[in-house]
């Protein structure tokens, strides 16, 4: 197993690369990783006190 990304290309992340479905590019580790779906719930009815918080669907494992 290689030592770490710093020894390869420093800590500055390159531009994201295309990933297969169910994956996305993680700037932290600079690789494609398992990814869930981000979603924004439908707005609450008029008069609701605050906007619905943004949530997400868990990654499919």
């Amino acid at each position: 197993m290689r030592r770490g990304p710093r020894s390869l290309r420093g800590r500055d992340a390159p531009a994201p690369t295309p990933c297969v479905p169910a994956e996305c590019f993680d700037l932290l580790v600079r690789h494609c990783v398992a990814c869930g779906l981000l979603r924004t719930p439908r707005p609450k009815p008029a008069g609701a006190s605050s906007p619905a918080p943004r949530t997400a669907l868990q990654p499919q494992e």
Epitope: M1, R2, R3, G4, P5, R6, R11, D12, A13, P16, P18, C19, E23, C24, F25, D26, L27, L28, V29, R30, H31, V33, A34, C35, G36, L37, L38, R54, A56, L57, Q58, P59, E61
Partner: antibody, heavy 125, light 107 residues
Framework: EVQLVESGGGLVQPGGSLRLSCAAS????????IHWVRQAPGKGLEWVAW????????DYADSVKGRFTISADTSKNTAYLQMNSLRAEDTAVYYC??????????????????WGQGTLVTVSS | DIQMTQSPSSLSASVGDRVTITCRAS??????VAWYQQKPGKAPKLLIY???FLYSGVPSRFSGSGSGTDFTLTISSLQPEDFATYYC?????????FGQGTKVEIK
């Protein structure tokens, strides 16, 4: 159910070694990054190392580089932290954690969503 | 490495209060900031990720905002179970770094 369970902590003399294990269940560690984070008594959180098993990619905090080695066995769904040349300042509760990612325009939006219960490492003579 | 500076380091508040904790990054981290809650003897819990997204199961009284270098965690109405220590963390560039923590105590 996703779960992380650490083991391997204990009392060790300065200069000694320990290997911590982080057994995962409910998901495959292969395509997620697994992190070790420690917390010295009464102090804050300090990131130690991460591994992305599918890529064989790792990184370390400067404070442990050259002394600690992170690894993973995907067949056992377990990550490890080999700690050598231990010092008094390595005394801490060590947690393993999974970084979860959500797809935001093709890029990960995420955080460490599941953590183990922690295992105490005490370095003392 | 990117430094994450939280303020205040501690605060006293009462149940029902609105509480705001801030975190400043030493360089631009876009929206790659998460917030965690930790209680004594327990592992941290993820509250907010990507600066403003509420993690699954977290009460909606928690919210996050910010981008670039300045970030905020807000608890709209403090509940008894919210007395804990809160940490920010950036994950834009390795190494991922944590703030020093903010302890929320009962007034």
């Amino acid at each position: 159910e996703v779960q992380l369970v650490e083991s391997g902590g204990g009392l060790v003399q300065p200069g000694g070694s320990l290997r911590l294990s982080c057994a995962a269940s409910g998901f495959s560690i292969a395509r997620s990054s697994i992190h070790w984070v420690r917390q010295a008594p009464g102090k804050g959180l300090e990131w130690v190392a991460w591994i992305l098993p599918s890529a064989g990619s790792t990184d370390y905090a400067d404070s442990v580089k050259g002394r600690f080695t992170i690894s993973a066995d995907t067949s056992k769904n377990t990550a490890y932290l080999q700690m050598n040349s231990l010092r008094a300042e390595d005394t801490a509760v060590y947690y393993c954690a999974r970084r979860v990612c959500y797809n935001r325009l093709g890029v990960c939006a995420g955080g460490m969503d599941y953590w183990g219960q922690g295992t105490l490492v005490t370095v003392s003579s | 490495d990117i430094q994450m500076t939280q303020s205040p380091s501690s605060l006293s508040a009462s149940v029902g209060d609105r509480v705001t904790i801030t975190c400043r990054a030493s360089q631009d981290v876009s929206t790659a900031v998460a917030w965690y809650q930790q209680k004594p003897g327990k592992a941290p819990k993820l509250l907010i990720y990507s600066a403003s997204f509420l993690y699954s199961g977290v009460p909606s009284r928690f919210s996050g905002s910010g981008s670039g270098t300045d970030f905020t965690l807000t608890i709209s109405s403090l509940q008894p179970e919210d007395f804990a220590t809160y940490y920010c963390q950036q994950s834009r560039i390795t190494p991922p770094t944590f703030g020093q923590g903010t302890k929320v105590e009962i007034k």
